[in-house]
Amino acid sequence: SQVSQNCHNGSYEISVLMMGNSAFAEPLKNLEDAVNEGLEIVRGRLQNAGLNVTVNATFMYSDGLIHNSGDCRSSTCEGLDLLRKISNAQRMGCVLIGPSCTYSTFQMYLDTELSYPMISAGSFGLSCDYKETLTRLMSPARKLMYFLVNFWKTNDLPFKTYSWSTSYVYKNGTETEDCFWYLNALEASVSYFSHELGFKVVLRQDKEFQDILMDHNRKSNVIIMCGGPEFLYKLKGDRAVAEDIVIILVDLFNDQYFEDNVTAPDYMKNVLVLTLSPGNSLLNSSFSRNLSPTKRDFALAYLNGILLFGHMLKIFLENGENITTPKFAHAFRNLTFEGYDGPVTLDDWGDVDSTMVLLYTSVDTKKYKVLLTYDTHVNKTYPVDMSPTFTWKNSKLPNDITGRGPQ
């Protein structure tokens, strides 16, 4: 049904969905703090621009009676229930910030006539790609997939002289929300990753993964998994690993690798870690003092969602344009705005671009070192360490298939 938007006459409201089922188990109070900090900044920016308007947020809480799993499994209906609540109250803001679960975002997008923008901290899955009024402020699965294909094909670097065309993917179903959708995208038979690879098998049992590590008949030397070093250790332990195995550990929202006093444990020597360029420090933030790195990124995405809305509001008001139009709803893409932690770039489909960093463990220093960076905006890899001190033979990444070419 058509809901009137509280979005005119100098008063602009943001509807923030505070869902019990969330991509990250973050206390809602922390997200409220992030939103409120963003509102203060937006008000300052509008005031600086000579725009005498009011910007507020309305926090919409679900009752939590039915949808109380706490993770994303029962989020589909919770999102729709919250929309119904907004509809009944006849109180919709200029923009909707909140659904972070892929299930809920997909369903809400599907089931509503969206003439307003939706900003999500999450919604990682491929099913949320290419949505005209959806903006995602945490790296979606598509970006990861494009990096992997780019890296697999690369064969002209001093440390990677072979193109790869094969991979195992470890996915046991206990993953966090981000990892679940990242691996889901790699598993999907119709995805870009699957299309570009000649061989790909999903390992679902711990034993399957453990057996591959020393299996002489394995079909690929490369294994992709998602999580932190502790997750890998629980699975791999101190088991022996064939010398030409390469484990790619996707751990995007974890900047602990860059801390000065961090030493890489021995079990990480066969591992390349894919993470995001550090910098989400939020040093001065009241809401971030006790947050883990992942949750910091989640709270930051909420804050940046508010700043993005403020950026677009300022542009439209300065141009004398109406906010409650499809033009506004479709405008949250193909732009750069000043986020809390630096410039934030959104691609043509409203998805955040970032610099991904591939790390290796130096056998000399036992420290994580940057091997290369990848700019998701231009789909380009930039080598950093031209002579890495790898564990692999000749300090080069091995071929992905044992026995094909010199090892």
Partner: nanobody
Framework: QVQLVESGGGLVQPGGSLRLSCAAS????????MDWYRQAPGKQREMVAT???????TYTDAVKGRFTISRDNAKNTVYLQMNSLKPEDTAVYYC?????????????WGQGTQVTVSS
């Protein structure tokens, strides 16, 4: 009226230190990151360092490891601590704040403070 007031410049010997300050009006300071630029005689103005609202910092390669940018939220002031100064650091240093513009830096500039590194 937005004001950015720089101070702390002066004459210093190579290897010496200086601390520049930039006081800003609160509505600017609390809304945007802030930059230090410099302009040497006969050269173009160049970015030196940025501090974002989060406190994250970025530096040009020429000053990395020698200069430190910081902000004091209680005083609405940004600082540039300059150590191991070199003759090539000689320039007028400008504070830059406000909304980013398409052309040159942010919308507001201070009047600049002269830093001369010479023996």
């Amino acid at each position: 009226q937005v004001q950015l007031v720089e101070s702390g410049g002066g004459l210093v010997q190579p290897g010496g230190s200086l601390r520049l300050s930039c006081a800003a009006s609160s509505n600017i300071f609390r809304a945007y990151g802030m930059d230090w630029y410099r302009q040497a005689p006969g050269k173009q103005r160049e970015m030196v360092a940025t501090i974002w609202l989060s406190g994250r910092t970025t530096y040009t390669d020429a000053v990395k490891g020698r200069f430190t940018i910081s902000r004091d939220n209680a005083k609405n002031t940004v600082y540039l601590q300059m150590n191991s100064l070199k003759p090539e650091d000689t320039a007028v240093y400008y504070c830059n704040a406000g909304a980013p513009t398409a052309s040159s830096g942010r919308q507001y500039w201070g009047q600049g403070t002269q830093v001369t590194v010479s023996s």
